[in-house]
Amino acid sequence: AIVFIKQPSSQDALQGRRALLRCEVEAPGPVHVYWLLDGAPVQDTERRFAQGSSLSFAAVDRLQDSGTFQCVARDDVTGEEARSANASFNIKWIEAGPVVLKHPASEAEIQPQTQVTLRCHIDGHPRPTYQWFRDGTPLSDGQSNHTVSSKERNLTLRPAGPEHSGLYSCCAHSAFGQACSSQNFTLSIADESFARVVLAPQDVVVARYEEAMFHCQFSAQPPPSLQWLFEDETPITNRSRPPHLRRATVFANGSLLLTQVRPRNAGIYRCIGQGQRGPPIILEATLHLAEIEDMPLFEPRVFTAGSEERVTCLPPKGLPEPSVWWEHAGVRLPTHGRVYQKGHELVLANIAESDAGVYTCHAANLAGQRRQDVNITVATVPSWLKKPQDSQLEEGKPGYLDCLTQATPKPTVVWYRNQMLISEDSRFEVFKNGTLRINSVEVYDGTWYRCMSSTPAGSIEAQARVQVLEKLKFTPPPQPQQCMEFDKEATVPCSATGREKPTIKWERADGSSLPEWVTDNAGTLHFARVTRDDAGNYTCIASNGPQGQIRAHVQLTVAVFITFKVEPERTTVYQGHTALLQCEAQGDPKPLIQWKGKDRILDPTKLGPRMHIFQNGSLVIHDVAPEDSGRYTCIAGNSCNIKHTEAPLYVVDKPVPEESEGPGSPPPYKMIQT
């Protein structure tokens, strides 16, 4: 038998909140449980769904969840079925609605001294209690001239008068919560003694020194008063005008006339109407002085024939909004055709060369007129005046390649060298007329050059080959001072190039012949065994037919190259003692010795009291410190060569003698002891 352990029970529920109808079943075999609502099976939704055997509500709905729920358990094998007790929800809710006119039938029928009934369309369960408001102020029950019926949710005004005019709203609250009217009702009951607007003043825009007129009329019974005020609350009357409104006139019908308007007259004017009863009515209107700003400049435009182009004219800022039109050759453009105006745009369709010229955009308003010209050029494809020619350019001199073209607008010329764009730098310059200048022609400038002349309409190009006429020059120029090692073999090379292979020779600078032990082999001066007499001035002469002769002068020095007689050794010194680094070099000319320590040259004039360099080249450092440690380099140099040798210096702490050590124990490394 199927037994319900837990049965659903009727319960209170809140609209839109969670709820659960419980159901638990015990049975010998498998059963399946489902729910009925008013006898119909309940389908699972996101809002309402089975949770085990129970039925869960994510948000109770007073419409969809009203009725009787029943839990049904069924054994599909035996067909046995059991039903739980019925359960239902007592759903509490409240729902906002509008304030509506119940009596009379329409607003048009509302007259002073008639009864007016308003209904509050807020509903709920349990029935809420109602509160009425006029212009946000609560209306208490039992006040004169109105009654509140909570049952009918009504507010009755008996009889209604002008004092009842206002915005009516209602709120209701119950155990569930509170709601206020979704739409309120404005009750307007005219009072003949209240001022009413007949004609309201409008904002006006006038040109300087023109006149401005504001109209203003009110009606009431008895007739209302009318007063004009300017911005600073100064009253304007025909008898008392403020100093800046000397030319103001107030007419009997309420209109205000201002003549010869000036900038100081611009501002807000208020027209105030006051009836016998009721509040004053204030109407505002602004007097603007007409103005028009300057128009932005147009950039000149370049168009190509056959295309369609548009030029937008941005109207200048102004009051009132300026009107805009285009003119060409003094004639206003039409609104259709091939060249026409569309809105603020100048449109040129299928452009022809004859369309070139000045077009003018005009803008005008009360304050005046502005105009701005735009120059329209119709581009043409460039044509040649002078193409670049194959040229022979001299090395080292400026070279020129022409690229003279004409077009509208002035064409842009770019040059390419070996298909690479030439960017202007210290060597290349492109003149305004398109000519390329190579400032100092190099041998490798001998190649193809191409110039391209362009306008927006198209481009033309031509190329030319440059042949460089190589100058007669030494390659490389011989060093003007050279050293040869005494008693050794030596060679002094000299080579040159030119348009034609030059012939090269050496001679003594005085023009005398070379001694027979010195040979000149196609420009290489060869000394089999250098003697002291070989020192002196020599001239290398390179010569060819087309270019003549060039000379390079060389001073040869005979030297005994540097060797070290004494080199510094690896040295370890106790802190506070003196270090001696010896260095002696020989050579001719006699070498000078410099020392480098810790990667900087030791300047003998700035050594300080602890360091000294002896005439023989040795370096002495007194009172050595740990920071003196490092590599020391002895550099020997003369006008012919330079040699260096280095050794490390270590500065160590003096060990504290142990008892067992005798006074004569030697240190564990080579020391300088002072």
Epitope: S512, S513, E516, G548
Partner: antibody
Framework: EVQLVESGGGLVQPGRSMKLSCAAS????????MAWVRQAPTKGLEWVTS????????YYRDSVKGRFTISRDNAKTTLSLQMGSLRSEDTATYYC???????WGQGVMVTVSS | DIQMTQSPASLSASLEEIVTITCQAS??????LSWYQQKPGKSPQLLIY???TLADGVPSRFSGSRSGTQFSLKISRLQVEDIGIYYC?????????FGSGTKLKIK
């Protein structure tokens, strides 16, 4: 067209001086070493003196050293030969030329005779 | 001084014949040798410079060569207008020296 035009020749007594000039045109004068070469009547050619393109180095044959002076003015493109202590053996046609790649003048006759 | 020994002193050759004139330098002069042609009553004219380079306007039948310190001028097909005296000049070392000349005649 290259042109070298000598002037200043003529008859001169032994021991006296004479100056020859050579006006150059049609080429870059300052690029070339210049020389004077002479030819005694019915004899061969004899180099006399030369000067480097910038004028800094001069060369003379031993027989004229100390008597003749070669000079040039690159701005005016002229070559000069100042001859002193003239001897009868200096009698010859004197040619101005670009040394090495010779363009020659038409020559000017110098006669040293008492 | 460098001596230039020119040979032969004179020679007669037939038209269209090959003619060779030599100059022997007393020491190495590299390629600093030129050849000149002089016609009676005229200034000498440059034929070849730098041992082998033909001067502008000189017919290609003229050529120059060198073997050590011996230099040669060759006329491949003798023409009537080639008669005259031919000189070599060494411009390697001052004093610059001319050869003694070779007088060329037509047979």
């Amino acid at each position: 067209e290259v042109q070298l035009v000598e002037s200043g020749g003529g008859l001169v007594q032994p021991g006296r001086s004479m100056k020859l000039s050579c006006a150059a045109s049609g080429f870059t004068f300052s690029n070339y070493d210049m020389a004077w070469v002479r030819q005694a009547p019915t004899k061969g050619l004899e180099w006399v003196t030369s000067v480097s393109s910038d004028g800094s180095t001069t060369y003379y044959r031993d027989s004229v050293k100390g008597r003749f002076t070669i000079s040039r003015d690159n701005a005016k493109t002229t070559l000069s030969l100042q001859m002193g202590s003239l001897r009868s053996e200096d009698t010859a046609t004197y040619y101005c030329l670009t040394l090495y790649y010779s363009h020659w003048g038409q020559g000017v006759m110098v006669t040293v005779s008492s | 001084d460098i001596q230039m020994t020119q040979s032969p002193a004179s020679l007669s050759a037939s038209l269209e014949e090959i003619v060779t004139i030599t100059c022997q330098a007393s020491q190495d002069i590299g390629d600093w040798l030129s050849w000149y042609q002089q016609k009676p009553g005229k200034s000498p004219q440059l034929l070849i410079y730098g041992t082998t380079t033909l001067a502008d306007g000189v017919p290609s039948r003229f050529s120059g060569s060198r073997s050590g310190t011996q230099f040669s001028l060759k006329i491949s097909r003798l023409q009537v207008e080639d008669i005259g005296i031919y000189y070599c000049l060494q411009a390697y070392s001052a004093p610059f020296t001319f050869g003694s000349g070779t007088k060329l005649k037509i047979k």
